[in-house]
């Protein structure tokens, strides 16, 4: 049976926690990604940003999990209007910011 949305979100949070806690060297060799607007459509926007990072095994599971939350197919080079224009940040900071936001959504009971 499909995993409840609340469980899927919790699993995504757990994965992001693992990434931030287990970080030894710079995450994804310090790769930069587009910063996103966290207020709406966060899952697709996060995936659109992170999908452009290739060859980084540390975030592959996160990419797969975000794909499960996003209703449409996302491919590299695709950007929605949710991107913060011309602002790039390191993947490590992106993951931290995303984690804070997703934990708040979870605590508020906003699973959709």
């Amino acid at each position: 049976s499909p995993v409840p949305r609340s469980t899927a979100l919790k699993e995504l949070i757990e994965e992001l926690v693992n990434i931030t806690q287990n970080q030894k060297a710079p995450l994804c060799n310090g790769s930069m990604v587009w910063s996103i607007n966290l207020t709406a459509g966060v899952y697709c926007a996060a995936l659109e940003s992170l999908i452009n990072v290739s060859g980084c095994s540390a975030i592959e599971k996160t990419q797969r999990m975000l794909n499960g939350f996003c209703p449409h197919k996302v491919s590299a080079g695709q950007f929605s209007s949710l991107r913060v224009r011309d602002t790039k940040i390191e993947v490590a900071q992106f993951v931290k910011d995303l984690l804070v936001h997703l934990k708040k959504l979870f605590r508020e009971g906003r699973f959709n």
């Epitope: 926690v17 806690q21 934990k103 708040k104 605590r107 508020e108």
Partner: antibody, heavy 123, light 107 residues
């Protein structure tokens, strides 16, 4: 040292509103990842979770009592207040407040508890 | 709501005995299971969190295990000061729910 102290009226009449205060010592509810829960225990019975408030004012309630409960915080006084409206004798219980810390995963484990305050609902 | 069922509801054992208390959840709680000890007339105290992790100061004789829906609290060698009621609590899904408690007495 982390401690929590509940205070309440002791005796409340049916239909009245019960107001309970939890004063926090040794930590601040303005600190990220801190939360406070209210739990009650009727005499000789088990534990029932009532409500929770996080440092950033996110509030959650037990659905069975949600319409009667309000949780709030006063960061300047380091206090959390719980109000329970339209009380009934079945609300007679020891009311506890407890601290939750969410570091990393979201645990909802209450690591420090107050000593509890007994509230009797009777006319 | 997730229902938490503890067994036994009470037990009597001798000092030095190994004691096990079971807790079953009505659905998978993914290791978000906490145990509390409540001595008579006192507030509960956190004993185990996230199935098997212990706060500082909890004696080594207490341990927790389990996964999915089934969890266990073990006291490897019962001591007189362990007389209390023990509660499990799931922290996976709101509303938070507790087991009915297991009262531990000394023979």
């Amino acid at each position: 040292e982390v401690t929590l102290r509940e205070s309440g009226p002791g005796l409340v009449k049916p239909t009245q509103t019960l107001t309970l205060t939890c004063t926090l010592y040794g930590f601040s509810l303005s600190t990220s990842d801190m939360g406070v829960d209210w739990i009650r225990q009727p005499p000789g019975k088990g534990l029932e979770w009532l409500a929770h408030i996080w440092w950033d004012d996110v509030k959650r309630y037990n659905p069975a009592l949600k319409s009667r409960l309000t949780i709030s915080k006063d960061t300047s006084k380091n206090q959390v207040v719980l109000k329970l409206t339209s009380v009934d004798p079945v609300d007679t219980a020891t009311y506890y407040c407890a601290r939750t810390v969410s570091s990393g995963y979201i645990y909802y484990a209450m690591d420090y508890w107050g000593q509890g305050t007994l509230v009797t609902v009777s006319s | 709501d997730i229902q938490m069922t503890q067994s036994p509801s009470s037990l009597s054992a001798s000092v030095g005995d190994r004691v096990t208390i079971s807790c079953r959840a009505s659905q998978d709680i993914r290791n978000y299971l906490n145990w509390y000890q409540q001595k008579p007339g006192k507030a509960p105290k956190l004993l185990i969190f996230y199935t098997s992790m212990k706060p500082r100061g909890v004696p080594s004789r207490f341990s927790g295990s389990g996964s999915g829906t089934d969890y266990t609290l073990t006291i490897s060698s019962l001591q007189p000061e362990d007389i209390a009621t023990y509660y499990c609590q799931q922290g996976n899904t709101l509303p938070l729910t507790f087991g009915g408690g297991t009262k531990v007495e000394i023979k």
